[in-house]
């Protein structure tokens, strides 16, 4: 009863003469354990005998021991783990047919048939390709061989056009009850060049001998592979020539469907054949040409062909690195004249005159000068001729004002207080002068551009400079105005003595002045309106108090005279001309007041007085005034006074005081 038995095995096993077979097999019996196992070759059921007949390759004994049997057949299973795996080694062609596994348990019997296909020669593996191979897209190539046996080592090897492939393969071996096979998988990134090539999978034995092989031709889908050809085979042509370009499709799978041509990346209209002809080429047809061919895989673009149309130089133009250019700067001149081939020689012109020694496309003037200004033009020449000279380009050279000078407009000489007019002049300037600057800066009037009016000119306006300015200022050399003025800073200065003047000293006074223009001067000394001398110094051999007073000196030149401030000459002297005066007269009546006054002439004034009587006896009085009150007759006599200052002492002559009796005294007598 088949429902009681469950036997798993591959169904058909493939091998070849001299190889081996390994039959993976497992069983399960529902009712009891397996007691007997017989392996038949091509078993047939004998109805009469009610049993299977055929060649017995293997038979298990009741005790589970294996008989010596055929040595090439091995039962590898056992009853314990329900394994019925067996092997035949070596296997022969006449082993082909059915292997019958007769299985008997206590209650059940079963015959399981396994097909054995042993070929005379090793059968080839089968290469399996993916449905579509496309260039640069990774695919896995599979080589499958429905064979695997533990006792017979084989190897699958990949070849491309007969040469072993460099990519590594993964080899998988299956010896399961589901399937028996050896499979080699090779990851591969086909290129267009592989299209049409033969891939082989070889079966090798342990010694490396090739047993069989399978071959396939690769059908690699790829975009068209293009090359471009030019006729005549030069890509450099002359204006007016004709050129043909051919787009060669070296390979395309599948066949190409569309063709187009591009120039500098832009499609050309109505050009959809593999041949592009350009009649009477013009300069504008120079460029990079390529063809684009598409198939179902995608578009492909050929390499670019650079078509160069040769022509004589065109009308030139000059490019100047900077205009306006600043004097002294570097200026580059470039001659632009489209030509093919590039011009080999250039002729340069400045204001229509040929510039000698300049034959290059560009030249440089390292330090530009004003005379370099003007129109520059050029002519370019190549093998096809000389180009037209263009209109030229203007070079404007800018520079600061040149040769700036200053002129004094008014008649000379200039006197202090005059109005002076100055003008600022220059020889040339680019751009034009737009303002002027003056030094020193003052609140001066600028009645017109470049003219300066200085009103009431000062004595010390010695030098003035002007600058004429455009973008830059150029200064003129300063002009000395040479202003004439009367002597300045006149003063009296005592030269000697260095200390205070004492009567009898030698004294020198100096008449000083700070400046005078002109320098020639005269001196005058004056005291109290009287002229004393005409030298710069006033000398006193022995000064007397009478010389004291207010002194002035005058200095004059051709412009005018200047007086010093009055200078007081002070002479110090000891008290002199002392005299005693009596306010009430020489005669005084007793009992009255007698007042004696010591009068003196002294510088500095007397600070101390002393009184003496006729006996030169010092009196106890120290003031300027001697007051006797009440006066007595005994006071009669001669008196004198002495005055002292810090210079010295002086004394008066004697003066007699007469004190007479009063009527009362007389009356008493």
């Amino acid at each position: 009863d088949s429902s009681k038995w469950n036997i798993e095995h591959p169904g058909t096993i493939y091998a070849w003469e001299g190889a081996c077979v390994w039959v993976p097999c497992t069983y399960r019996v529902l009712d009891g354990a397996l007691e007997t196992f017989i392996l038949f070759h091509n078993p047939e059921y004998n109805q009469n005998m009610s049993k299977f007949e055929g060649t017995r390759l293997y038979e298990s004994t009741k005790d589970g021991k294996l008989p010596s049997g055929q040595k090439r057949v091995q039962f590898l299973g056992n009853k314990i783990n329900n394994n019925c795996t067996l092997s035949i080694h070596p296997v022969h062609v006449n082993d082909s047919g059915q292997l019958g596994l007769r299985m008997v348990s206590k209650t059940e019997k079963w015959m399981e048939r396994i097909h054995l296909n042993v070929s005379e020669r090793p059968f080839p593996p089968r290469i399996q390709l993916p449905p579509k191979l496309q260039e640069s897209q990774e695919v896995t190539l599979t080589c499958l061989l429905n064979f695997s046996c533990y006792g017979y080592q084989i190897q699958l090897q990949w070849l491309l056009e007969g040469v072993p492939m460099r990519q590594a393969a993964v080899t998988l071996t299956s010896l399961s009850t589901k399937s028996v096979f050896t499979r080699s998988e090779l990851k591969f990134s086909p290129q267009w060049s592989h299209h049409g090539k033969i891939v082989t999978c070889e079966l090798h034995d342990v010694d490396g001998k090739v047993l069989s092989e399978d071959m396939v031709q690769l059908n690699v889908k790829h975009t068209p592979k293009l090359t471009i050809e030019v006729t005549p085979n030069e890509t450099t042509v002359r204006k007016g020539d004709s050129v043909t370009m051919t787009c060669k499709v070296n390979s395309s799978n599948p066949e190409y469907t569309t063709v187009s041509w591009l120039k500098d990346g832009i499609p050309l209209k109505e050009q959809n054949t593999l041949m592009l002809t350009l009649h009477k080429v013009t300069k504008s047809q120079s460029g990079r040409y390529c063809c684009r061919v598409s198939n179902d895989v995608g578009p492909a673009t050929s390499e670019k062909v650079f078509l160069q149309v040769q022509y004589a130089p065109e009308s030139s133009r000059v490019q100047i690195s900077q205009s306006p250019a600043v004097e002294g700067s570097e200026v580059n001149f470039l001659c632009i004249s489209p030509a093919n081939p590039l011009p080999t020689n250039y002729t340069w012109y400045h204001n229509g005159k040929e510039v000698q020694g300049r034959t290059e496309k560009q030249f440089q003037i390292q330090k530009i000068l004003p005379w370099h200004a003007g129109t520059y033009s050029c002519e370019a020449e190549n093998i096809l001729g000389i180009g037209e000279r263009g209109p030229g380009t203007e070079l404007d050279v800018q520079y600061p004002p040149k040769k700036v000078t200053m002129v004094i407009e008014n008649p000379t000489p200039i006197r202090e207080g005059d109005t002076v007019t100055l003008s600022c002049n220059y020889s040339s300037s680019n751009p034009i002068v737009n303002h002027y600057e003056w030094r020193p800066r003052g609140a001066w009037e600028e009645p017109s551009l470049g003219v300066l009016k200085i009103q009431n000119i000062g004595w010390n306006n010695t030098a003035v400079a002007c600058a004429a300015c455009n973008n830059w200022c150029s200064w003129a050399s300063p002009v000395t105005l040479n202003v004439l003025y009367a002597p300045r800073g006149v003063r009296v200065r005592k030269i000697k003595p260095l200390s205070e003047i004492h009567s009898g000293n030698s004294v020198s006074l100096q008449c000083d002045f700070s400046s005078s223009h002109p320098k020639e001067v005269q001196f005058f000394w004056e005291k109290n309106g009287s002229l004393l001398g005409k030298e710069s110094q006033l000398n006193f051999d022995s000064i007397s108090p009478e010389d004291a007073g207010s002194y002035s000196c005058w200095v004059n030149n051709s412009i005018g005279q200047t007086a010093s401030k009055a200078w007081t000459l002070e002479v110090l002297y000891a008290p002199r001309r002392l005299r005693v005066s009596m306010s009430q007269g020489n005669q005084v009546m007793e009992g009255k007041t007698a007042t004696l006054i010591c009068e003196s002439d002294a510088n500095p004034p007397v600070y101390s007085y002393a009184w003496f009587d006729w006996n030169n006896q010092s009196l106890p009085y120290s003031g300027r005034m001697l007051r006797l009150e009440p006066v007595k007759v005994q006071h009669s006599g001669a008196y004198w006074c002495q005055g002292t200052n810090r210079v010295g002492k002086g004394h008066s002559p004697l003066i007699t005081l007469t004190v007479y009796y009063s009527p009362q005294t007389i009356g008493r007598r």
Epitope: S136, Q137, E138, Q153, Q155, Q157, P164, M165, R166, Q167, A168, A169, V170, T171, K187, F188, S189, H204, G208
Partner: antibody, heavy 119, light 106 residues
Amino acid sequence: QVQLKESGPGLVAPSQSLSITCTVSGFSLSRYTVHWVRQPPGKGLEWLGMIWGGGSTDYNSALKSRLSISKDNSKSQVFLKMNSLQTDDTAMYYCARPHDFDAGGFAYWGQGTLVTVSA
Amino acid sequence: QIVLTQSPAILSTSPGEKVTMTCSASSRVNYMYWYQQKPGSSPRLLIYDTSNLASGVPVRFSGSGSGTSYSLTISRMEAEDAATYYCQQWTSYPLTFGAGTKLELK
């Protein structure tokens, strides 16, 4: 010129996972395969696995259950992730590239990154 | 997986001598690749596709072999060649390397 540079954590604790990045320059990852190879200190070289230009992978069967290789073509980076590290995974880890897109032989190698598995 | 066995493990030689080291594969490989590695440096490709010299490799290095047996030869040893050399197969995944031959100067 072709360059590969590995960057890794240096130290990994046992049973933890390892992530290494291989940053490449001078070629496109969409065209070339990149392989990972390791070398324990004082020992030989062991191939770990590879990633194809198209993104498919092949691994050393002995490590397949613990390995994962991926990449980011736009960043030119290939990543190796390895789980359940043990001390015998201590090694210098290299990324390498064959000399041609369909060729054998690692013509280009990174300088390697040392990974130490230790508690 | 394909196992690559390199011999000898250590090789001592003098400058100017010819050096040969071998790499044996457990099953056939299409091509063999050879690397040189010096301490502290990344491996450097010497030979690709069995016998082709990688860029910048001196001509004293050469490779040969087929099937399961391959070799690397240095025609005249130089001091700078002291390093460890690894073979590698690229026929079957996983890609595998030999254990290396350490080349020392005597």
